[in-house]
């Protein structure tokens, strides 16, 4: 799925109302120093196509994340507020029924979180080039992280 | 519990540099950006910049592009913001601080390192 | 660069009482709005982010509202330890912007 047509400032506003805080609560009791981010994304539409993957993709050692209240919460913002995007994950959902039942949250599964927020953070605020063109809103789809 | 600890008072002259340093502990550091902000004596807030420690973007305000260059040191986690080609209106209280867990505020700030610029 | 305009630049409140700052920005911020308060001889402290969202800690008697380019500040009760500088930011676009400070003193 393109997330370039995507309602940004709608989903930050629901990532900022609820979602956020459901992340919180899922990471709670870990150390904030325990976990590196090495997942980055450069734009918003880029921070969304590996928030998805993240969130709605079973790994290894983690195959339960869908099922969290942050990750139905982000299903129902996108299919909102990105056009078409409810019509792609017909597949994805069957596939995610036949992921295992039970919510089990493993150090894998925080690790996953970890980043999460990370991406999250970034969408939120992406880190654009200088400023004439830096308008969170509209053009940060159109550039790229500016390397001193 | 997160802190940010920056250096010393410098005292500059007129066209030389300083680089002020900002110590990070209680949370990865390479997971949060550090903004740079200054203060004039009895003025406002004023925003210089922002590096990302992770990978070492960076954005700067266009009043100081040129003259300010921010890095950071993973492996000591700590930030640093130089300035350059020093003047008696660069006389101020540095501050770094820790973008907030959702990335739209500053959250835990330094406690300021004076910079006095003077012949 | 997005002006961010503060009002008063200082008011003087009667311990109890309510207080409102009014920022408004020179162009739409949509709700990338934040709110710190420096109290005298220290860092400035996050208090309000994202318009209306408390940070933690930070009591109740902090609102704040708004959206697009007019937002506020209120204090349903001010207290002793409010006194200081209240600055609002916007975080919407680069370079980031503070206004110029509204200064808080108790009666």
């Known amino acids: 799925y393109d997330f370039t047509n995507c309602d940004f400032e709608k989903i930050k506003a629901a990532y900022l109302s609820t979602i956020s805080k459901d992340l919180i609560t899922y990471m709670s009791g870990t150390k904030s120093t325990e976990f590196n981010n090495t997942v980055s994304c450069s734009n918003r539409p880029h921070c969304l196509t590996e928030i998805q993957s993240l969130t709605f993709n079973p790994t290894a050692g983690c195959a339960s994340l869908a099922k969290e209240m942050f990750a139905m919460k982000t299903k129902a913002a996108l299919a909102i507020w990105c056009p078409g995007y409810s019509e792609t994950q017909i597949n994805a959902t069957q596939a995610m029924k036949k992921a295992r039942k039970s919510k089990v949250t493993t150090n894998k599964c925080l690790e996953q979180v970890s980043q999460l927020q990370g991406l999250w953070r970034r969408f939120n605020r992406p880190l654009l080039k200088q400023q004439g063109s830096s308008d969170y809103k509209d053009d940060d789809d159109k550039h790229h992280h500016h390397h001193h | 519990e997160v802190q940010l600890v920056q250096s010393g008072a410098e005292v500059k002259k007129p066209g030389s540099s300083v680089k002020v340093s900002c110590k990070a502990s209680g949370y990865a550091f390479s997971n949060y950006l550090i903004e740079w902000v200054r203060q004039a004596p009895g003025q406002g807030l004023e925003w210089i910049g922002v590096i990302d420690p992770g990978n070492g973007d960076t954005n700067y305000n266009e009043n100081f592009k040129g003259r300010a260059t921010l890095t950071a040191d993973k492996s000591t986690s700590t930030a640093y913001m130089e300035l350059s080609s020093l003047r008696s209106e660069d006389t101020a209280v540095y501050y770094c601080?820790?973008?907030?867990?959702?990335?739209?505020?500053?959250?835990?700030w330094g406690q300021g390192t004076t910079v006095t610029v003077s012949s | 660069s997005i002006v961010m305009t503060q009002t008063p630049l200082s008011l003087s409140v009667t311990p109890g009482q309510p207080a409102s700052i009014s920022c408004k920005a020179s162009?739409?911020?949509?709700?990338?709005v934040t709110w710190y308060l420096q109290k005298p001889g220290q860092s400035p402290q996050l208090l309000i982010y994202?318009?209306?969202n408390h940070y933690t800690g930070v009591p109740d008697r902090f609102s704040g509202s708004g959206s697009g380019t007019d937002f506020t500040l209120k204090i349903s009760r001010v207290e002793a330890e409010d006194v200081g500088v209240y600055y609002c930011?916007?975080?919407?676009?680069?370079?980031?912007?503070f206004g110029q400070g509204t200064k808080l003193e108790i009666k």
């Open positions: 930011q916007q975080h919407h676009r680069f370079p980031l912007t």
């Open positions: 162009q739409s911020v949509s709700s990338d």
């Open positions: 994202y318009v209306s």
């Open positions: 601080a820790r973008e907030d867990n959702t990335g739209t505020a500053f959250d835990y």
